[in-house]
């Protein structure tokens, strides 16, 4: 089968109430079939590529475990399995200040060096 291209799928928006939790869905495809090398998953807020990171985790070669390196205020937790092309993120104890746009990103290292980030992101509406 032909190699897949990089793509990311996120919904335009997610709505939730302050104090509740929300899930920011993000799935991706990539051209590196059977990739099992080092992987980093990142979520940032505000703007793509340059916005501040709110979550980051890293998985070692051959591992499905994406070890959390950053979770802003301890409120961000990865639900998706990056090895299954899913970066879905759970945000706990929502505050009005969380009402912004969020962007998911995945990075491959090791034998393959490649990365991809959602351009449009998902808008989180907190009411």
């Amino acid at each position: 089968s032909p190699a897949q291209r990089w793509s990311m799928q996120v919904p335009p928006e997610v709505s939730a109430e302050a104090g509740d939790a929300a899930v920011l869905p993000c799935t991706f495809t990539h051209p590196h079939r059977h990739y099992d090398g080092p992987l980093t998953a990142i979520w940032r807020a505000g703007e793509p590529y340059a916005g501040p990171q709110v979550f980051r985790c890293a998985a070692a070669r051959g591992s499905e475990l994406c070890q959390t390196a950053l979770s802003l205020h301890g409120r961000f937790r990865l639900l998706g399995n990056p090895r299954r092309n899913d970066l879905s993120l759970r945000v706990e104890r929502l505050a009005l200040a969380d009402d912004r746009r969020y962007f998911c990103r995945v990075e491959f290292a090791g034998d393959v060096h490649d990365r991809y980030e959602s351009r449009h992101g998902v808008r989180l509406h907190v009411t």
Epitope: G80, R84, D86
Partner: antibody, heavy 121, light 107 residues
């Protein structure tokens, strides 16, 4: 050949802790994730958490996060699962399982024989 | 957490007949479902991974299918040694979650 050999059955009182071991052989222990899965009597399977022995990184099911600690000793190729504040509902067979992979697919390819933990006053 | 619901809970099939077990996920889990067989007093054993891939040494009478939310394990011609409980498991989301199990018996 790959083998996971677990420690023997345990009887514990409510409120106590238990530590179950899982000794691996036949493969390079630090490279593969090891998960712990439990099965209450006559019930289904429940994933508790995972460790990557090479890095020592762990991930837990939120249900158990406050009470479970998973560790690994690469010098002896042994993974451990410690569960604290035991209650009667923790009576179960506890399994370790290797998370093998093939061409970018992960799966539980080898399981320990199971360790029965009985919690009773 | 993702809920995996198997049907039926138990199944009695004549030797040589087909057995079909269904597994429904509470949300889309792609093709990230494995099937495990557990015989009485034994540890689970891997049958199928990634929905359709038969694990090494597993007889070809075992077939997996499905994606998204609906998955099926089929035993095309039931043998006596297939008496066991069968579990589906999703690994698309953490925590990994299993179905409640389907007990397969001989009619």
């Amino acid at each position: 050949q790959v083998q996971l050999v677990q420690s023997g059955a345990e009887v514990k009182k409510p409120g106590a802790s238990v530590k179950v071991s899982c000794k691996a052989s036949g493969y390079t222990f630090p490279r593969y994730d090891v998960s712990w899965v439990r099965q209450a009597p006559g019930q289904g399977l429940e994933w508790m958490g995972v460790i990557h022995p090479g890095s020592g990184g762990t991930g837990y099911n939120e249900k158990f996060k406050a009470r479970v600690t998973i560790t690994a000793d690469t010098s002896t190729s042994t993974a451990y699962m410690e569960l604290s504040s035991l209650r009667s509902e923790d009576t179960a067979v506890y399994y370790c399982a290797r998370r093998g992979l093939n061409k970018g697919y992960w799966f539980f390819d080898f399981w320990g024989q199971g360790t029965l933990v009985t919690v009773s006053s | 957490d993702i809920v995996m619901t198997q049907s039926p809970d138990s199944l009695a099939v004549s030797l040589g007949e087909r057995a079909t077990i269904n597994c429904k996920a509470s949300q889309n889990v792609g093709s990230n479902v494995d099937w495990y067989q557990q015989k009485p007093g034994q540890s689970p054993k891997l049958l199928i991974y990634e929905s359709t891939n038969r694990y090494t040494g597993v007889p070809d009478r075992f077939t997996g299918s499905g994606s998204g939310t609906d998955f099926t394990l089929t035993i095309s011609s039931l043998q006596a040694e297939d008496v066991a409980v069968y579990y589906c498991m999703q690994s698309n989301f953490f925590p990994f979650t299993f179905g409640q199990g389907t007990k397969v018996e001989i009619k």
